[in-house]
Interface confidence: low
């Protein structure tokens, strides 16, 4: 038998070997595909199957527009002019080349020694599903489940039957200062079909370190406020994108939604204490600000009560 690959939507002509080029012809086409429950014999006279597959005057079989359901086996049995029976056997596979794959949600930079999501490679509209592969500096990246982790997802469109592939790459770069180039390629796995490549992304790898310049600003300055007054604490961080900010009072997290600003209206003595903010940045982990003391007092003459500006309470996860 002969293996044939046909592009979805395009016509396919299968020749019936040995058949005379014009009538009278003794031939029979049989097919077993996704359209048939078992073997279906086609009549040269035509019929309801003509829109799907019909026999041409020269004995060849025409599929005007191949679809996924046309995958299967096609057989022709013909008697040539000398009365000898000749058989043809075809195994038909169809394919569809997807659009060019893309890397969506790419990282802006990577941090050495911690897991970083590089991005998600997406290919839409393939058949068969095919495969996505990641490349680092032009070389194939083999996932090892440790420094290189790939999460794959394949979905099939319920109507068209075409596949969408997603591949999420997470890496732990070993050292900073490098500029690795990542790309992704889609391959159908068919002969003579070249892989489709994404545009490469080049990312800077930096050494792990806390977000620079985390400061806790307090209003009123000095942190001394009269009962019933308002205190505004602002966690000022220069990191981009802005990290999530949680608030700590006397060493315990406050049960509040993350926010860079903490407003304490109508303060009472129960609001007194040491406050700090903790910034959680995806590539660094938490970093705590220097603490600030809040004092509630009738008189404003006790002097500044700011917490000492020491080291951050949290280092980075290297």
């Amino acid at each position: 038998g002969q293996n044939i690959t046909a592009r979805i939507g395009e016509p396919l002509v299968l020749s019936c070997k040995g058949a005379p080029k014009k009538p009278p012809q003794q031939l029979e086409w049989k097919l077993n595909t996704g359209r048939t429950e078992a073997w279906k014999v086609l009549s040269p006279q035509g019929g309801p199957w003509d829109s799907v597959a019909r026999i041409l005057p020269n004995g060849s079989l025409l599929l005007p527009a191949t679809g996924i359901v046309d995958e299967g086996t096609f057989r022709c049995r013909a008697t040539n002019r000398r009365g000898k029976e000749v058989k043809s056997n075809y195994r038909v596979r169809v394919y569809q080349i997807p659009g060019k794959p893309e890397i969506v949600d790419p990282a802006s930079e990577l941090t050495a020694s911690v897991p970083n999501k590089v991005g998600t490679c997406v290919s839409e509209g393939s058949y068969p599903a095919g495969t996505l592969s990641w490349h680092l500096d032009g070389k194939l990246l083999i996932p090892d489940g440790k420094e290189t982790l790939v999460k794959e997802e394949t979905r099939r469109h319920p109507e068209t039957g075409l596949f969408t592939l997603r591949s999420e790459l997470t890496v732990i770069p070993t050292q900073g200062g490098t500029h690795p180039t990542f790309s992704c390629s889609f391959s159908l796995g068919l002969p003579r079909r070249r892989p489709l490549n994404t545009a490469p992304i080049q990312l800077r790898v930096r050494e792990p370190g806390p977000p620079e310049g985390i400061q806790l600003l307090v209003e009123p300055e000095g942190g001394i406020v009269a009962p019933g007054g308002t205190v505004t604490l602002t966690c000022a961080i220069s990191a981009q994108p802005p990290p999530q900010v949680h608030w700590i009072k006397d060493g315990a997290p406050l049960p509040l939604a993350p926010s860079p600003v903490l407003l304490l209206p109508e303060v009472g003595h129960e609001d007194e204490g040491t406050y700090s903010c903790v910034a959680t940045h995806p590539s660094h982990g938490p970093q705590e600000s220097p603490p600030v003391s809040i004092r509630v007092t009738e008189t404003g003459d006790e002097g500044p009560a700011e917490g000492s500006v020491g080291e951050s309470g949290l280092g980075t996860l290297a």
């Epitope: 982790l149 999460k151 732990i172 792990p208 959680t280 982990g285 938490p286 980075t316 996860l317 290297a318």
Partner: antibody
Framework: EIQLQQTGPELVKPGASVKISCKAS????????MLWVKQSHGKSLEWIGN????????FYNLKFKGKATLTVDKSSSTAYMQLNSLTSEDSAVYYC??????????WGAGTTVTVSS | QAVVTQESALTTSPGETVTLTCRSS?????????ANWVQEKPDHLFTGLIG???NRSPGVPARFSGSLIGDKAALTITGAQTEDEAIYFC?????????FGGGTKLTVL
Amino acid sequence: EIQLQQTGPELVKPGASVKISCKASGYSFTDYIMLWVKQSHGKSLEWIGNINPYYGSTFYNLKFKGKATLTVDKSSSTAYMQLNSLTSEDSAVYYCARSDYWYFDVWGAGTTVTVSS
Amino acid sequence: QAVVTQESALTTSPGETVTLTCRSSTGAVTTSNYANWVQEKPDHLFTGLIGGTNNRSPGVPARFSGSLIGDKAALTITGAQTEDEAIYFCALWYSNHLVFGGGTKLTVL
């Protein structure tokens, strides 16, 4: 064989400090972070913090900040955890575990710390 | 702080398949939580089984597998054996804070 060997049980008085060690063997000590975990009697596990032996950088659960101090000695492939100002709440089994972020595959046998006067 | 919830106890029979789950109070567990599964045998013997949601630790039998099922992390033991009787803890990373579940006591009868 990869092993994490922890010090034996410790009986300490309230207010005192204790330093637990975790000696690594069978792998490159600086290639993995070391995780420390607390298991109180009849309770679940609590993450204390991590240390990256390569950088010496630490990363603490806020709950244990000030209570635990993590250090390493690269020359002896040993990780240490010092617990300060001990109270009965600190009586527990403390574990070190090797981690590479994806998993914590090898654990020490644990060090039992009992705080009692 | 997030709370991680597990079944307190499960019972299975040798050869059966059993699935332990791990729920997060903050919403769906995702691959970004790098779900870990740790086994505790008597005498405080801990072994890491699964990390990064579905990566088996070196030397762990293939009958142990990790996955996400719905909005939870899951540990499946396919063809449980009597030696699998243990307490299983899951742990989830939250922006580099690690939180353990309460543990599931698995009995293999």
